[in-house]
C-alpha cells in the first residue's frame, strides 16, 4: 500500500501552502525507501536518494514556481510515481445567510470568505435548539444534527423543510479542502429571518364616475402556505406618473381604494407583504401595476349634499382572484366614505 495518505481531491495531486515548507510523498514505494526526485520533463536532479528523507521531497517556502508535476524514481531507476503539486490556502469560515419565504421552511446560502485556490466542498447540517422550560433561559442539549440537503444543481444553498416557527436553529456550514476544514455556526430563528415573497396578481382599476379613485387588489404570494396559521399584512404605495414620491397606506385586506389619485394621470401602484405580527421583515415590492382614474362621468343618481356625510355607501360584492378567506377579506370598499370632498368635486 502507498505510504502517502490520499488527501480529499483528485488522485495523484498533493497540496501545500505558499510560503510554507511542503513535503511531497512518492506514492509507489515503501515508506522510508530512498528515491530520486525530478521535475517532469527536466533532467536535473532535485533531491537524491542520499538525502536521508526517504520517500519524501521537501520544498522550503514553496511558491507558484514550484507548482507542477514531479517524478520519483527508486534506486534501480524504476518509476516510483508521479505527483502533481498544487498550492493554495486552508479554508476560511464561509459566510452564511438564511432566509424564509414562509413559516414552515427556510433556506441558507453560503459563499467563501476567502478563495483557497483548491478543490472545495461544503458540509451542511443543522440542529434544533430548545429551551428547558418557560421561565428558564438555559437551553437543553440541542437535537440533531440533521443534514441540510443541498441543491442538486450545485448552487450554494440548502433547505430545511418542516421547521418550527418558534424554535431556534443552529446552522453548520463547513468548508472543506485538502488542507483542512473551517466551520461557520449561525443561529437563526424563523421569526427573525421571515421575509414573504411579494404579493401576486396586483390589479389596478378605475372606479367609474370617480375621477380621483383607483381600486387595487392582489393575492397572497403562491409560496405562502394555503391554509395559513399566520396571516400577512400589506403595505401599498402609489404615485402619479412622473411624480418622484410614493404615498403609502396599510390596507386592511387584499384590496385598497385610493381616494386621492390625480385625475387623468396614470398611477403606478406596488404592494409589499409582512407577517401580520411583525415577525421578520417586509417583502420586496411587487412589480408595479398601472391604472388611470376614470374620466369624471357623473353617476346617474347623485345623493343630496347631506347624505354624502351621513350615508355609508354600499357596493355589490366584488369578485377577487384569491380564494375566499373570511378572516383576510373585509367587505370591499369601492366607494370609501372617508373622502366626501372628492365626491363634491365631481359635482362642480
Amino acid at each position: 500500500s502507498s505510504p502517502c495518505p490520499q488527501a480529499w481531491g483528485p488522485p495523484g495531486v498533493q497540496y501545500g501552502q505558499p510560503g510554507r515548507s511542503v513535503k511531497l510523498c512518492c506514492p509507489g514505494v515503501t515508506a522510508g525507501d530512498p528515491v530520486s526526485w525530478f521535475r517532469d520533463g527536466e533532467p536535473k536532479l532535485l533531491q537524491g536518494p542520499d538525502s536521508g528523507l526517504g520517500h519524501e521531497l521537501v520544498l522550503a517556502q514553496a511558491d507558484s514556481t514550484d507548482e507542477g508535476t514531479y517524478i520519483c524514481q527508486t534506486l534501480d531507476g524504476a518509476l516510483g510515481g508521479t505527483v502533481t503539486l498544487q498550492l493554495g490556502y486552508p479554508p476560511a469560515r464561509p459566510v452564511v445567510s438564511c432566509q424564509a419565504a414562509d413559516y414552515e421552511n427556510f433556506s441558507c446560502t453560503w459563499s467563501p470568505s476567502q478563495i483557497s485556490g483548491l478543490p472545495t466542498r461544503y458540509l451542511t447540517s443543522y440542529r434544533k435548539k430548545t429551551v428547558l422550560g418557560a421561565d428558564s433561559q438555559r437551553r437543553s442539549p440541542s437535537t440533531g444534527p440533521w443534514p441540510c440537503p443541498q441543491d442538486p444543481l450545485g448552487a450554494a444553498r440548502c433547505v430545511v423543510h418542516g421547521a418550527e416557527f418558534w424554535s431556534q436553529y443552529r446552522i453548520n456550514v463547513t468548508e472543506v479542502n485538502p488542507l483542512g476544514a473551517s466551520t461557520r455556526l449561525l443561529d437563526v430563528s424563523l421569526q427573525s429571518i421571515l421575509r414573504p415573497d411579494p404579493p401576486q396578481g396586483l390589479r389596478v382599476e378605475s372606479v367609474p364616475g370617480y375621477p380621483r379613485r383607483l381600486r387595487a387588489s392582489w393575492t397572497y404570494p403562491a409560496s405562502w402556505p394555503c391554509q395559513p396559521h399566520f396571516l400577512l399584512k400589506f403595505r401599498l404605495q402609489y404615485r402619479p406618473a412622473q411624480h418622484p414620491a410614493w404615498s403609502t397606506v396599510e390596507p386592511a385586506g387584499l384590496e385598497e381604494v385610493i381616494t386621492d389619485a390625480v385625475a387623468g394621470l396614470p398611477h403606478a401602484v406596488r404592494v409589499s407583504a409582512r407577517d401580520f405580527l411583525d415577525a421578520g421583515t417586509w417583502s420586496t415590492w411587487s412589480p408595479e401595476a398601472w391604472g388611470t382614474p376614470s374620466t369624471g362621468t357623473i353617476p346617474k343618481e347623485i345623493p343630496a349634499w347631506g347624505q354624502l356625510h351621513t350615508q355609508p355607501e354600499v357596493e355589490p360584492q366584488v369578485d377577487s382572484p384569491a380564494p375566499p378567506r373570511p378572516s383576510l377579506q373585509p367587505h370591499p370598499r369601492l366607494l370609501d366614505h372617508r373622502d366626501s370632498v372628492e365626491q363634491v368635486a365631481v359635482l362642480a
Epitope: A92, R93, V95, V96, T109, W110, S111, P112, S113, Q114
Partner: antibody
C-alpha cells in the same frame, strides 16, 4: 506593492449621496473579502459593511442598512460604497480593508474623509 | 450584536514597562478576537489575530491570550513607538464589532 487607496470622500449636504471607491493592488483582489470601516472624528472604529470575494453575499451595520450599498468589480480590482440619504452622524474617515477571511483586516487603506453638513 | 468592552480606557507607562489591556465580549466568541494598533492620523494595523497569533512582521513584545469572553493584550516592554490607541475586535459574529479603544502613552 500591496496597497489599498480610497477616493470619493468630500463635503455633502444631509440627504445627499456619495460614492466611495477603493483601488487595490499588489494582491489577488478577487480572492478576498473586503470591508469598509469608519471612524468619526475623535471616536473609535466602527465596522460598516463587508462583501465576499464573489460579491454574492454582503453584510451591513444596522446604522447604515438600507442607505449604503457595498459592491465590487473584480475585473477592476475595485471596491465601492454607495452612500445615500447621508446624515450628520455619517461624518467620518472611511477606511477600506482586506481579509483574510471575514472579519479580520490585515491590510488597510489610508482612509477618505466624508463630511455631512449643511 | 456582540458588545466589546476594554479597560482601561487610557494608561500612562514608562519605557520598558509591561503593559496589559483587557477586553471582554458580551457573549462567547471562542478565540475569534483580533487586536489592532492605531497611531494618530494613521490607519489601524493588525497586531494579533485569533486571540494569540502574532501577525507577520509584528515585534514579539506584543502578545495576546484568552478565549470565550475574556481576553488580554500585553506589551512586554513598552517602547516609545508603541504610543497609540489599541482596539480589540471580535469576528465570531458575521457583524464584526470593535472595542472602544485604549489609549497608551509614555509617562
Amino acid at each position: 506593492e500591496v496597497q489599498l487607496l480610497e477616493s470619493g470622500g468630500g463635503l455633502v449636504q444631509p440627504g445627499g449621496s456619495l460614492r466611495l471607491s477603493c483601488a487595490a493592488s499588489g494582491f489577488t483582489f478577487s480572492w478576498y473579502s473586503m470591508t469598509w470601516v469608519r471612524q468619526a472624528p475623535g471616536k473609535g472604529l466602527e465596522w460598516v459593511s463587508s462583501i465576499v470575494p464573489y460579491g454574492d453575499l454582503t453584510q451591513y451595520a444596522d446604522s447604515v442598512k438600507g442607505r449604503f450599498t457595498i459592491s465590487r468589480d473584480n475585473s477592476k480590482n475595485t471596491l465601492y460604497l454607495q452612500m445615500n440619504s447621508l446624515r450628520a452622524e455619517d461624518t467620518a474617515v472611511y477606511y477600506c480593508a482586506k481579509g483574510p477571511g471575514w472579519g479580520s483586516f490585515d491590510l488597510w487603506g489610508r482612509g477618505t474623509l466624508v463630511t455631512v453638513s449643511s | 450584536d456582540i458588545q466589546m468592552t476594554q479597560s482601561p480606557s487610557s494608561l500612562s507607562a514608562s519605557v520598558g514597562d509591561r503593559v496589559t489591556i483587557t477586553c471582554q465580549a458580551s457573549q462567547d466568541i471562542n478565540n475569534y478576537l483580533n487586536w489592532y494598533q492605531q497611531k494618530p492620523g494613521k490607519a489601524p494595523k493588525l497586531l494579533i489575530y485569533d486571540a494569540s497569533n502574532l501577525q507577520t512582521g509584528v515585534p514579539s513584545r506584543f502578545s495576546g491570550s484568552g478565549s470565550g469572553t475574556d481576553f488580554t493584550f500585553t506589551i512586554s516592554s513598552l517602547q516609545p513607538e508603541d504610543i497609540a490607541t489599541y482596539y480589540c475586535q471580535q469576528h465570531e459574529s458575521q457583524s464584526p464589532t470593535f472595542g472602544p479603544g485604549t489609549k497608551v502613552d509614555i509617562k
